[in-house]
Amino acid sequence: AQNITARIGEPLVLKCKGAPKKPPQRLEWKLNTGRTEAWKVLSPQGGGPWDSVARVLPNGSLFLPAVGIQDEGIFRCQAMNRNGKETKSNYRVRVYQIPGKPEIVDSASELTAGVPNKVGTCVSEGSYPAGTLSWHLDGKPLVPNEKGVSVKEQTRRHPETGLFTLQSELMVTPARGGDPRPTFSCSFSPGLPRHRALRTAPIQPRVWEPVPLEEVQLVVEPEGGAVAPGGTVTLTCEVPAQPSPQIHWMKDGVPLPLPPSPVLILPEIGPQDQGTYSCVATHSSHGPQESRAVSISIIEPGEEGPTAGSVGGSGLGTLALA
């Protein structure tokens, strides 16, 4: 069978080989398409509702005025010339529709290095067959599930036209120290060969790298955190970051209901004040960062306090990025 591709909505003429150029002709067309159940036979006499879909021309060719998805299938012509020689023509018809240029919607203006970011969603509307969407970074294809790249795809079919809408959402994790202005584009590749890809205009988000917060220092006075009953303990949270972050305080892992402050004073220490204290610095462009934990304890008169203080672990580190 000879492969024929025809654009949806366009006319199509299929030649019936070996047929006399004009009537009288002995020929018949057989169609097995989405419009037929098994084989439909069309003769030069024509007539009836099929004429609006396909009709035999005076020269024996089959004419389809506007090809649709339903017309995909096999078209066969059997013709006998004046000498009684039989010729068969066999066509496999496939239809296509090129969509509009793909578009990127919900495009991100800024990405944060080191964390996953949604770059945007590429949308292609009105294709047949469905085709595929692919993403490019600085002109080179991006491979999903490699180097922090992930793609979520969705294909929908229009209930009336039968045409496809494709969506592809790109997520990337930009490398620290990488290109601060990467250029992403998306392209639609048709499902039928010999048609070139359609590419979107480029999207150029800005990538920024949050400054790694320098370690939050927790200073306790008196050193070691051991104090006699009724004494005073001063905890100071030191953060080198600028502008100064908000400082909140934790006791035994629970936030203390106090306004933000870099200094926590515990006057007239009693048993209820004993515990493990830490501070949490929250920078507006970072997540919270917790200091080391210090243990505050009461020493009875005559007891020796711990020499270097009882210090907990290193805190939770960075809880979240921007």
Epitope: I104, S107, A108, S109, E110, G120, P180, R181, A201, P202, I203, Q204, P205, R206, V207, W208, E209, P210, V211, S284, S285
Partner: antibody, heavy 121, light 108 residues
Framework: QVQLQQPGAELVKPGASVRLSCKAS????????MHWVKQRPGQGLEWIGE????????NYNEKFKSKATLTVDKSSSTAYMQLSSLTSEDSAVYYC??????????????WGQGTSVTVSS | QIVLTQSPAIMSASPGEKVTISCSAS?????MYWYQQKPGSSPKPWIY???NLASGVPARFSGSGSGTSYSLTISSMEAEDAATYYC???????????FGGGTKLEIK
Amino acid sequence: QVQLQQPGAELVKPGASVRLSCKASGYTFTSYWMHWVKQRPGQGLEWIGEINPSNGRTNYNEKFKSKATLTVDKSSSTAYMQLSSLTSEDSAVYYCARDGLGYRPIAMDYWGQGTSVTVSS
Amino acid sequence: QIVLTQSPAIMSASPGEKVTISCSASSSVSYMYWYQQKPGSSPKPWIYRTSNLASGVPARFSGSGSGTSYSLTISSMEAEDAATYYCQQYHSYPPMYTFGGGTKLEIK
């Protein structure tokens, strides 16, 4: 420290072209994009376009695509903007500004003093 | 193209007064940037990524907002704050920076 030096003023005739310069110092010129911004007397700021000095890649405001051409000379760490077919509408102060990407995601972190362009016959 | 509309265009405030300048975007934007410009000077970066103060900006300034509505606030106006403030955003598709029309803030 970072400095962007621009000539103070240019007087040009209608229909002519002018090339404005912006000499960068105090940082690695090729590591930061450079913007150009227009400000007409008593008016607001208008972004013209930007250029990546390392590879010459440009982005333009559609409005200025046929008016402005951005180039760089890496050897002298200088960015240029050529303005063509000048009219009185082009009389303005033109600023170059360094892109502030990096640890502080400021769009334009250092600005030149601006060049005042007067179009007059 | 996204349009940024600042309001008011001109305003005056007394020392110690709280001041809020608004910037409205014609469609949703991720972040807003603010610049301060005084007569005869170049603009200076003032607030970046909606709420972060640029280096040297007094703590009485703050920025907030999301979507289409953003603002710059001065908790207690001082004489040195008299200037024109511009909001600005970046759109990545196609790459384009847009400035608001500016708000001229005067001291009473």
